[in-house]
């Protein structure tokens, strides 16, 4: 999937599996991504896990999950709040959209979480105080935190080259993210389609293009605008919202 | 379609989620299934053609025949938890400051530095 | 996103018959009761129809009834609008609404009767 | 049948005023249940109808708070705040009390 950093650096990342997206002293968030094609390395969400820890005289530790298909508007035990103590209604979710969007509050913590179902897969987007990104115990266990920390170099796919690829007029038969690309998306319509939707050409726009050219499927030109939609919603610095191509640079410290 | 509202405000006034109910909780569990009904019934004409409506209807009704309940007698109100010590209102509110980040930081500095983080796409 | 793309109209002649299309997506098709509603040319809004989320049930307005059919294929995630014995008067934007009551809409596709 | 008669017809309102539109329906729209099944719909010029109000007075999700809907019984109303330019269309009430379904006539509002 394509990650927004808490650094505002912008990724594309092909980690299969599950891996910590936030892991801190109050909020433990997990995404499990699956590839989008047999055989490509261009992977999407397909399960999410977050935990609320309990915290003081707020709220009890609360799970919630979503997966493909499955959007639920509650907490894994079907309560809709913190639980029973004192301030538990400063952890509420509220579905925005029946099965397709739900945002949760966390106001003990200052937080507010989106999660989506676009077509098949999930988005996430989480605005966060730096007091709470930063409220680590062990600095060191920070390594794979996806939000603070970027993916591994090695985990990144280099959709600029991918474009230039794509942009040419012989496309190749196998760019390295997706061995078998969609011939029904020709890059002018890719183009057309996301522009559509994403009129400023910054890297959201460039994701929409890259994840039509790898699959096919134009609900992912709708994850782009929504991940944008809710970026302006959670983005405290409005100037910072677009973010536009410039080199590469190396996560901090991971391997 | 307000299906899922009656949903959840059963949830909440049966605390025992979907666990049978203690023999002397009986009487508590069918007046909440009574509500329950009462609130489907409301929703009829805008959920009736909807899976959700038909699967709280089917679901009532066997909860009615497992547990005995009669379709006549008391319903029951949302069930509001007790809270800690008295003196609040009966509304479980947001109180302890500590509950509420942005208020509890004003107290020893500026206002918060916010981040963003987002995940989509492939 | 919900999404309702209608298909399916054209010109016909009186007495003539058409089956009109409504293909959903970006919800769960299977679990929800769905409307035809129709709009004639310059005037306001008709209800139709309706037709619950297992087919067990359909609902029709009285200026159609016995005329119009509505069905549905779940697997198909699609929703149907039989018409037959189209008159004049049937000339309208069709137009297929999700849910019990109509919550989302399609855009609509014209349907004209006449000789 | 239920008629449901709306008024006035033409709204012609000031940017930045309020309007209300009335919606009369020939027979109570609460059911033995207690429940009022009443709706409002906009429709902008050359678009689909959009679901604004449900149950009377519950907003659709996306809906901004400007509008708002009230009523029991027999009598309706639909109120916006603080009219904008994006307001502008025809408006529609709706009930699902009874069988069959139907729609008032519409009100056109448009700025003055």
């Known amino acids: 999937p394509h990650l927004r950093t808490f650094t505002d650096h912008f990724q594309t990342c092909k980690v299969q599996g599950a891996w910590p997206l936030i892991d801190n002293n109050y909020l433990n968030v997990q995404v499990t991504n699956t590839p989008v094609l047999p055989g490509s390395a261009a992977t999407a969400t397909s399960k999410l896990t977050i935990i609320f820890k309990n915290f003081q005289e707020c709220v009890d530790q609360k799970v919630y999950q979503a997966e493909m298909d499955e959007l639920p508007s509650a907490f894994a035990d079907g309560s809709k709040n913190g639980g029973d103590k004192h301030g538990a209604n400063s952890l509420k979710i509220t579905e925005k959209v029946s099965g397709q969007h739900v945002e949760i509050q966390a106001k003990y913590i200052g937080t507010t979480i989106v999660v989506r179902q676009v077509g098949r897969y999930l988005t996430f987007a989480v605005r966060m105080p730096e007091e709470v990104v930063n409220a680590v115990e062990d600095r060191d266990s920070q390594g794979l935190y996806l939000c603070l920390r970027g993916c591994p170099l090695n985990q990144q796919i280099d959709f600029q080259a991918f474009r230039a690829n794509a942009e040419s007029p012989r496309r190749p038969a196998a760019a390295s993210p997706s061995p078998v690309v969609p011939e029904t998306f020709p890059y002018e319509t890719a183009v057309a389609k996301c522009k559509e939707k994403l009129p400023v050409e910054d890297l959201y726009y460039q994701a929409c293009v890259f994840d039509l050219l790898t699959t096919g499927d134009v609900n992912f030109t709708l994850a782009a605008y929504y991940a944008l939609e809710d970026g302006k919603m959670l983005h405290s610095n409005k100037d910072k919202l677009h973010l536009f191509e410039r080199t590469r640079e190396l996560p901090g410290a991971v391997a | 379609c307000k299906i899922l509202k009656c949903n959840s405000e059963f949830w909440s006034a049966t605390s025992s989620g979907s666990h049978a109910p203690a023999s002397d909780d009986v009487p508590e569990f069918c007046a909440a299934l009574r509500t329950y009904a009462l609130c489907t019934r409301r929703t009829a004409r805008t959920c009736r053609g909807d899976l959700a409506y038909h699967s709280a209807v089917h679901g009532i009704e066997d909860l009615m025949s497992q547990h005995n309940c009669s379709k006549d007698g008391p319903t029951s109100q949302p069930r509001v938890r007790t809270l800690p010590p008295a003196g609040d209102s009966q509304e479980r509110s947001d109180s302890p400051e500590i509950c509420h980040y942005e208020k509890s930081f004003h107290k020893h500095s500026a206002a918060p530095n916010y981040t963003h983080c987002g995940l989509f796409g492939d | 996103e919900v999404q309702l793309v209608e298909s399916g109209g054209g010109l016909v002649q009186p007495g003539g018959s058409l089956r009109l299309s409504c293909a959903a997506s970006?919800?769960?098709?299977?679990?929800?009761?769905m409307n035809w509603v129709r709009q004639a040319p310059g005037k306001g809004l008709e209800w139709i129809g309706m037709?619950?989320?297992?087919?067990?049930?359909?609902h029709y307005a009285d200026s159609v009834k016995g005329r119009f059919t509505i069905s549905r294929d779940n697997s198909k995630n699609t929703l149907y609008l039989q018409m037959n014995s189209l008159r004049a008067e049937d000339t309208a934007v069709y137009y297929c609404?999700?849910?019990?009551?109509?919550?989302?809409w399609g855009q609509g596709t014209m349907v004209t009767v006449s000789s | 049948d239920v008629v449901l008669t709306q008024s006035p017809l033409s709204l012609p309102v000031t940017l930045g005023q309020p309007a209300s539109i009335s919606c009369r329906s020939s027979?109570?729209?609460?059911?033995?249940?207690?429940?009022?099944?009443l709706e409002w719909f906009q429709q902008r010029p050359g678009q689909s109808p959009r679901l604004l109000i449900y149950?009377?007075?519950s907003r659709f999700s996306g809906v901004p708070d400007r509008f708002s809907g009230s009523g029991s019984g027999t009598d309706f109303t639909l109120k916006i705040s603080r009219v904008e330019a994006e307001d502008v269309g025809v408006y529609y009430c709706f009930q699902a009390t009874h069988d069959p379904l139907s729609f008032g006539q519409g009100t056109k509002l448009e700025i003055k």
């Open positions: 609404a999700k849910g019990s009551t109509p919550d989302y």
């Open positions: 149950d009377v007075s």
């Open positions: 027979q109570s729209l609460e059911d033995s249940d207690g429940g009022t099944f």
């Open positions: 970006g919800f769960t098709f299977s679990n929800y009761g």
């Open positions: 037709i619950y989320y297992d087919s067990s049930e359909k």
